[in-house]
């Protein structure tokens, strides 16, 4: 017999999101505009195309990538699909809010857009470590917390440091990650007697989850070059990245085979490991001066991925109650974290190539911003979770965990679908 | 050459509209992003709006944001200022100006104006 | 950042070496360029990056400095120098100049 949603989430989900939806459309209503300067129609469509492959990555991307769950594949495609449009649409306002609101309006541009469509994927990297034990009710707090906090991160970040767009939504990798660990570290850990073959992955759903890495593999260099000012900056991006994931997927797909007794290749380290190199050249990728280097920094990443991938699951698994194959919430901290030692590292090299004296101060500047963004993350991660164990939002039971007729209508209700 | 020419001054009463263009000669507009900087009779120079290179992005300064609109045309090599509700002190030749960008140590990226127009006379007097 | 220049105004010959200092409200790393503006006309850029001489500006004009103490060297007075120059920063993108340094003939 089918699983239905619990009776009082069948009246709160609808009228939750569906009020608050209302108020989205009556603050846009009241307080935005379109950019009415638009004169050069080409240059309209090549600046929608940045954020037509920053959509690509969230929806199919990071929609595809965590549906590998043998009992919650549809649940995670259209669950990401949902946060993401809720997402954009408050990570817009907000980011309207506190950077222009106090000249009237908050005016709408493609580019207001394209922050939007970042931050968002934001709640995407996070949702990893809980999807599968959360409702959309749940999901839909997890967003607004979420894109709050990181708007509010890159605000601060933006006037204590002076970062541009570029650095302060780099940030993203270690806040996203960080954010989503504490998160689940709140929820509820231990999966019951019987519920362990639904967090398994299987294959036709390892298949989806596999074009959800390679679409994010395909569209990286535009998420990390979206923000720059600059074409040369931007070409510059671009090549770094792309290196960066193209060794990458070799060192995931060779260092797999290599960490398995038998030499086989594990599903789940190549899911996440292909996207390494992309994740660690993602801070200062407009800086590195040339191809080797994006190239050994991928094949670092991707080291590190494997490696994480392998001793990291266990740990996550006891602590925090993630299942061995959402493994990218542990991965993008550490890759994150590599992402902005490396940052460092190149600021300390120029630095130093200056002769000018000011490495100690930018180095403190940079673990400043490094710091604060953890420090956000998990305590807005922590807050997050503490709402989500509210008895409000009748959470799914343990025994219904990682399992999609929870949520869906299946007309065949097919036990192992 | 390259080279970056304004028009579009004049002489405005307070509350009024003009409408300030920049054509770029000697380079493609579309591989920069561009800024315009006022000064004041006697005073010095003071940076207005910048927009980037493919015009997805823009700023102003505290004192026009709400009232200017920088914008441009990449496929007419123009960038364009529009000034709203004009006001006394917006008296000034206007400039515009190239934001170069360029690699330095210890920097990462930095702009600087590396090619400017000769100015146009913008007057708001009743 | 606010970019406080000194002096606001100088007299010098020909031949003299003369400096030129800006002060940022907060560090500003290296991001910083000079530009040199002759009556009547549009700025140049001399120096960028605190340091750098642009193409085609003469040696004479040396930058120096970063975090927030900057000068301006001109170390041997040409009739041609005598102009108001301009100290500008790029650390944040609200652009900001210093007040100018008008060098007169003495």
């Known amino acids: 017999m089918s699983s239905k949603y619990p009776r009082s989430v069948r009246r709160c989900l609808p009228l939750w999101a569906l009020t608050l939806e209302a108020a989205l459309i009556l603050l846009f209503y009241f307080f935005t505009h379109y950019d009415a300067s638009l004169e050069d129609q080409k240059g309209l469509v090549a600046s929608y195309q940045v954020g037509q492959d920053l959509t690509v990555m969230a929806a199919i991307g990071l929609g595809f990538l965590t549906s590998s769950f043998r009992r919650h594949s549809w649940s995670s495609v259209a669950f990401n699909l949902f946060m993401l449009a809720l997402g954009v649409q408050w990570a817009i306002l907000l980011d309207g809010f506190l950077s222009q609101f106090p000249s009237g309006k908050v005016v709408i541009t493609l580019f207001s857009i394209r922050l939007a469509t970042m931050s968002a994927l934001s709640v995407l990297i996070s949702v990893d470590a809980v999807l599968g034990k959360v409702n959309l009710a749940q999901l839909v707090v997890m967003v607004l917390v979420e894109v709050t906090a990181l708007g509010n991160l890159r605000m601060v970040i933006s006037n204590i440091f002076n970062t541009d767009y570029h650095m302060n939504m780099m940030h993203i990798y270690v806040f996203a990650a960080y954010f989503g660990l504490s998160v689940a570290w709140c929820l509820p850990k231990p999966l019951p007697e019987g519920t362990e073959d639904k967090d398994q992955t299987a294959t036709i759903p390892s298949l989806s989850a596999m074009l959800g890495a390679l679409f994010l593999w395909m569209f990286w260099p535009s998420f990390n070059s979206a923000l720059l000012r600059s074409p040369i900056e931007r070409k510059n991006a671009v090549f770094n990245t792309y290196y960066a994931v193209a060794v990458s997927v070799v060192t995931a797909i060779s260092g797999s085979s290599l960490a398995h007794p038998q030499g086989k290749i594990s599903k789940t380290y190549v899911h996440s490991a292909v996207l390494a190199g992309g994740v660690a050249v993602g801070t200062s990728c407009h800086l590195i001066p040339s191809p080797w280097l994006a190239m050994v920094l991928g094949l670092v990443a991707g080291l590190i991925s494997v490696g994480g991938a392998k001793y990291l699951p266990g740990c996550c698994n006891r602590v925090l109650g993630i299942p061995h194959s959402s493994i990218m919430g542990y991965n993008f901290s550490l890759l994150g974290l590599l992402g902005e030692i490396i940052y460092i590292v190149l600021l300390v090299l120029d630095t130093v190539g200056a002769g000018n004296g000011m490495i100690g101060f930018q180095v403190l500047l940079s673990i400043g911003e490094l710091s604060l963004a953890i420090v956000i993350a998990l305590m807005s991660g922590l807050l997050t979770g503490l709402l989500l164990n509210l008895k409000i939002w009748k959470a799914p039971h343990e025994a219904k965990y990682f399992d999609d007729q929870v949520f869906w209508k299946f007309p065949h209700l097919a036990v192992g679908f | 050459e390259v080279q970056l020419l304004e028009s579009g001054g004049g002489v405005a009463q307070p509350g009024r509209s003009l409408r300030l263009s920049c054509v770029a000669s000697?380079?493609?507009?579309?591989?920069?992003?561009m800024h315009w900087v006022r000064q004041a009779p006697g005073k010095g120079l003071e940076w207005v709006a910048d927009?980037?290179?493919?015009?997805?992005?823009?700023d102003y300064a505290d004192s026009v944001k709400g009232r200017f609109t920088i914008s441009r045309d990449n496929s007419k090599n123009t960038l364009y200022l529009q000034m709203n509700s004009l006001r006394a002190e917006d008296t000034a030749v206007y400039y515009c100006?190239?934001?170069?960008?360029?690699?330095?140590?210890?920097?990462?990226?930095?702009?600087?104006?590396?090619?400017w127009g000769q100015g146009t006379m913008v007057t708001v007097s009743s | 950042a606010e970019l406080t220049q000194s002096p606001s105004s100088l007299s010098a010959s020909v031949g003299d070496r003369v400096t030129i200092t800006c002060r940022a409200s907060?560090?500003?790393?290296?991001?910083l360029n000079w530009y040199q503006q002759r009556p009547g006309k549009a700025p140049n850029l001399l120096i960028y990056?605190?340091?750098t001489l642009q193409r085609g500006v003469p040696s004479r004009f040396t930058g120096s400095g970063s975090g927030t103490d900057f000068t301006l060297t001109i170390s041997s007075l040409q009739p041609e120098d005598f102009a108001t120059y301009y100290c500008?920063?790029?650390?944040?993108?609200?652009?900001?100049f210093g007040q100018g340094t008008k060098m007169e003939i003495r």
């Open positions: 927009i980037w290179f493919d015009g997805s992005n823009k």
């Open positions: 990056a605190a340091s």
């Open positions: 000697g380079f493609s507009l579309r591989s920069y992003g």
């Open positions: 100006a190239r934001d170069w960008r360029v690699r330095a140590f210890s920097s990462g990226w930095l702009s600087a104006f590396d090619i």
């Open positions: 907060q560090s500003i790393s290296t991001y």
């Open positions: 500008q920063q790029s650390y944040t993108t609200l652009w900001t």
